[in-house]
Amino acid sequence: YDFTNCDFQKIEADYLRTISKDLITYMSGTKSTDFNNTVSCSNRPHCLTEIQSLTFNPTPRCASLAKEMFARKTKATLALWCPGYSETQINATQAMKKRRKRKVTTNKCLEQVSQLLGLWRRFIRTLLKKQ
């Protein structure tokens, strides 16, 4: 999906209002400095691409993030403010339902959510501090 035509201001508002709090709740008891940055993004559409990938694509050591509250809200926000996004996700959701895993917050998942927080922080800053 090409995130170029999303309403970035509305997505930012949703993130600040709800998604960020759910991410921080998930990370409770863990310092963000416990994990080094292993993923970055270079503009707002790129940030959303990487956010979608980390949130919804299961990885071998962290398969269950898509069921978390922050993921559900992320999905709703993207569906609301990115034209045509929900249509592209129907097949992906059906495939995900077949992969039921028990809910365990592993250190690898904490690391992945830490990276998500970093990506969202980059998304909400429209410019570098300078230049």
Partner: antibody
């Protein structure tokens, strides 16, 4: 852990070519800008080139423009530097480094490789 | 092209504060990064975006930037701080990385 490992250095005669490689691991390579930086013996750091996270744009130092070519392969997590028409003044340790970027601005180089030595001598 | 000027050397007594400067035309409008390099080793980022510090760098390292001068401050200097220090910026007008000439810090 996050790592950059350079290879391909060696001794080469003036006018000849050499290809350096940098293997990245432990991070999502395709999301970072990548640089080559060199350091002549006993001298300071000199920036050589940078390639955008997606390979869509490239910039070179004036001293190497037209002779060096930076490329990346995001499917293999590798960065390359093709060095042609080498001169004695290209003798240096060559480092690769990663850099987050925001639009067309590159940020700090937060991870560096250990370097590979290139000696240009007849 | 943009030029960054550093003093070739700075000395500090153990336990005292060292300040390394980096001069450039209106450098305060740019984000400055600082690297430490020990002999035979690769550079290590110690301060980025003027004053931010990577999580693995001690709080003794700090930075500031305004006007025509950026400054790296190392408080309570230790023997292990002996190294070369380089400032760096991204010059948007030329799309080039620019490094300062480097400063050798000696802990007396």
């Amino acid at each position: 852990q996050m790592q950059l490992v350079e290879s391909g250095g060696g001794v080469v005669q003036p006018g000849r070519s050499l290809r350096l490689s940098c293997a990245a691991s432990g991070f999502t390579f395709r999301t970072y800008g990548m640089h080559w930086v060199r350091q002549a013996p006993g001298k300071g750091l000199e920036w050589v080139a940078v390639v955008w996270y997606d390979g869509s744009d490239i910039h070179y130092a004036d001293s190497v423009k037209g002779r060096f070519t930076i490329t990346r392969d995001n499917s293999k997590n590798t960065l390359n530097l093709q060095m042609n028409s080498l001169r004695a003044e290209d003798t240096a340790v060559y480092y690769c480094s990663r850099s987050p970027q925001w639009e067309d601005i590159f940020e700090s180089m937060d991870i560096w490789g250990q370097g590979t030595m290139v000696t240009v001598s007849s | 092209s943009y030029v960054l000027t550093q003093p070739p050397s700075v000395s500090v007594a153990p336990g005292q504060t060292a300040r390394i400067t980096c001069g450039g035309n209106n450098i305060g409008s740019k984000s400055v990064h600082w690297y430490q390099q020990k002999p035979g080793q690769a550079p290590v980022l110690v301060v980025y975006d003027d004053s931010d510090r990577p999580s693995w760098i001690p709080e003794r390292f700090s930075g500031s930037n305004s006007g025509n001068t950026a400054t790296l401050t190392i408080s309570r200097g230790e023997a292990g701080d002996e190294a070369d220090y380089y400032c760096q910026i991204w010059d948007s007008s030329s799309d080039h990385v620019v490094f300062g000439g480097g400063t050798k810090l000696t802990v007396l």
